[in-house]
């Protein structure tokens, strides 16, 4: 009869930039040599080759040189496709044909994903609010895929969903930009969250916003930063604001503007003697020359580094002279944990299994969570590490040691502290004996 | 009803700078996406510079550096400031709101900018 | 950058037939959920004006006759029955990825 080729029935969901496993296999008869084999990896809609191996050979990737198939478990079966550095535009059907004397195919989806960022909160106007202005509150969340939800509620988490226009802008690698816009008149204060989700991921990245309108004090100059952290993801650029209330008459030649590292008073930026001195600080930091004039001293960091994480005090001097200290709290998402299983061959109940859990590239550092299939907690026989690359980002690896039940289901959840970001792996043992893994 | 009046254009030399001003009405205006799009003599349509608000902005490459998209929340302005311009920025300049999808839902009538020795 | 090519560059058609304008991507605008693929009416000495958005949406206020359709690569543009004010340049644009860009236009004419 026809070769039965087996695929998973639910899309491989893969992080932009980590690679995949596309999972096919075949029961191979006694005797099978891989001489007899065929195998033709291809894009489902288009029939465009991705990879094969023919005439007892691999025959290599057709797929920008990111395929590889796994040579060593070709004869067990196993004819599973490695996608490296997935990109957007691999989401698709994938479909895996075998032929030895008889012929198979099956497809299976790739759903390629992305963490939104933590969303950023702007508020215009931002100085001298008082009840009943209304003000335009804009919430961005970068470089997420597929499109996210947005959603808005007040202090006392009860939906916003009048006046929000919201618009997804794609980017240069056709990951999504997230703005979302939300009119309000302003109360005595008030609290606005916004929530965006990550349909794919199940990811929410949330900020909020207190407004309390009041008039400021008269006297030396009040420069304002924001209380919470500035939260931002490695590599894409950080606003730190900055403002103060420029008097009737003030002109730029009266302002010098200095920001510098709050603990080694290292120069950052400044602006002096009515021009922008420019950065000192590796070239990556700028101002908003435009916005200067209306008291807007904010400084934007771009490409953003582990090492800058830290205190940065913004200091105005006009006549009078004022200053303050703002966070930048470093972020980067873990990926989504890659489970390995050793011994990974003929278990049966009451073995010892080593369970590792590994989530790779994020920051800060890690909270890993194991639990059962039932959802109960496993604490004991864990050993986790974080190593820290060449970036200062972190690798985390979770060691469960377990002993075999007739099944089981174990959990694994690596935790962003910052982003509150939750990345989970899973692995199900069945059955005696078995081999891991069901599916590569 | 939604209405853009682009202004502001007129010949200038290579080399020289621009700011083209579109008063928007009939719409919240800090509640959308604006943008610029110019055609040029040939009939040819480039997007030219989108802002979500004062610090939210993209460009293309080829615009990035010269051209800087701004907006006046207060008086429903938006702004194309131009500078170091070439013959090639030559075309007419439409001021645009943005769909939710960067689409171009609305547009203005356009104002004429030359550059010429 | 994502080049769109439409064809024809000018089509010529009888008053009460169909109309279609293809546009041509040169790689996907389409994820699973939308066709970033947009279309536009322009008329001499006026802006250009949106017909369809996301592929095969009618924006507000343009007649049925309009339909959009295609994803992926593959984008078409129908006008059916064809009336003697359709006469103009049709434009698509994509709004996939950074830049957004816009074909090259086709011009109908009213037989």
């Known amino acids: 009869g026809a070769l039965e080729v087996q695929v998973p029935e639910d899309p491989v969901v893969a992080l932009v930039g980590t690679d995949a496993t596309l999972c096919c296999s075949f029961s191979p008869e006694p005797g099978f040599s891989l001489a007899q084999l065929n195998l033709i990896w291809q894009l489902t809609d288009t029939k465009q080759l991705v990879h094969s191996f023919a005439e007892g050979q691999d025959q290599g990737s057709a797929y920008a040189n990111r395929t590889a198939l796994f040579p060593d478990l070709l004869a067990q079966g196993n004819a599973s496709l490695r996608l490296q550095r997935v990109r957007v535009a691999d989401e698709g059907s994938f479909t895996c044909f075998v032929s030895i004397r008889d012929f198979g195919s099956a497809a299976v989806s790739l759903q390629v994903a992305a963490p939104y960022s933590k969303p950023s909160m702007t508020l215009e106007p931002n100085k001298d609010l008082r009840p009943g202005d209304t003000v335009t509150i804009t919430c961005s969340s970068y470089q997420g895929y597929p499109e996210a939800e947005v959603f808005w509620q007040d202090g006392q988490g009860v939906p916003l969903t009048g006046n929000v226009t919201t618009s997804q802008m794609a980017n240069e690698q056709g990951l999504f930009d997230v703005h979302s816009i939300l009119r309000v008149v302003l109360g005595a204060n008030g609290t606005y969250s916004c929530l965006v989700r990550n349909p794919v991921l199940q990811q929410d990245a949330h900020s909020s916003v207190t407004i309390t309108p009041q008039r400021s004090p008269t006297g030396a100059v009040e420069v304002q930063v924001p209380e919470d952290p500035v939260v931002a993801l490695v590599g894409t650029d950080a606003t730190l604001r900055c403002s103060f209330s420029p008097e009737p008459g003030f002109s730029l030649a009266q302002l010098n503007l200095i920001w510098q590292l709050t603990d080694t008073k290292q120069l950052v930026h400044s602006f002096t003697e009515g021009r922008d001195q420019g950065s000192a600080y590796a070239n990556r930091t700028a101002l908003f020359p435009d916005l200067l004039a209306q008291g807007n001293a904010s400084l934007r960091l771009q490409r953003v580094r582990v090492a800058d994480e830290g205190s940065f005090t913004c200091f105005v001097s006009i006549r009078d002279f004022g200053s303050a200290a703002v966070s930048l709290q470093v972020a980067a998402p873990y990926s989504k944990p890659s489970m390995t299983l050793e011994p990974n061959k003929d278990l049966r109940p009451g073995d010892t299994v080593t369970i590792t859990c590994s989530s790779y590239r994020g920051y800060p550092e890690a909270e890993v969570f194991w639990q059962d299939g039932q959802g109960v907690p496993l604490t004991g026989n864990v050993t986790t590490s974080q190593m820290a690359n060449e970036q200062g980002l972190f690798d985390v690896h979770s060691v469960l040691r377990v002993v075999l039940g007739a099944n089981g289901t174990y959990s694994c959840l690596v935790r962003n502290p910052v982003l509150q970001q939750d990345a989970h792996g899973s692995v199900t043992i069945t059955g005696q004996p078995m081999t891991f893994p069901p599916e590569a | 009803e939604v209405k853009l009046v682009e202004s502001g254009g007129g010949l200038v030399q290579p080399g020289g700078s621009l700011k083209l001003s579109c008063a928007a009405s009939?719409?919240?205006?800090?509640?959308?996406?604006m943008s610029w799009v110019r055609q040029t003599p040939e009939k040819r349509l480039e997007w030219v510079a989108s802002i979500v608000s004062s610090n939210i902005t993209y460009y293309p490459d080829s615009m990035k550096g010269r051209f800087t998209i701004s907006r006046d929340n207060a008086r429903n302005i938006l702004y194309l400031q131009m500078s170091s311009l070439k013959s090639e920025d030559t075309a007419m300049y439409y001021c645009?709101?943005?769909?939710?999808?960067?689409?171009?839902?609305?547009w203005g009538q356009g104002t004429l900018v030359t550059v010429s020795a | 950058d994502i080049v769109l090519t439409q064809s024809p560059a000018s089509l010529a058609v009888s008053l009460g037939q169909r109309a279609t304008i293809s546009c041509r991507a040169s790689?996907?605008?389409?994820?699973?959920?939308?066709?970033?693929m947009h279309w536009y009416q322009q008329k001499p000495g006026q802006p250009p004006k949106l017909l369809i958005y996301?592929?095969?949406n009618l924006e507000s206020g343009v007649p049925a006759r309009f339909s959009g359709s295609g994803s992926g690569t593959d984008f078409t543009l129908n006008i059916h029955p064809v009336e003697e004010e359709d006469a103009a340049t049709y434009y698509c644009q994509h709004s996939r990825e950074l830049p957004y860009t816009f074909g090259g236009g086709t011009k109908l004419e009213i037989k």
């Open positions: 009939g719409f919240t205006f800090s509640s959308y996406i």
């Open positions: 645009a709101r943005s769909g939710t999808r960067a689409w171009f839902a609305y």
């Open positions: 996301l592929a095969s």
């Open positions: 790689k996907s605008v389409s994820t699973s959920a939308y066709s970033y």
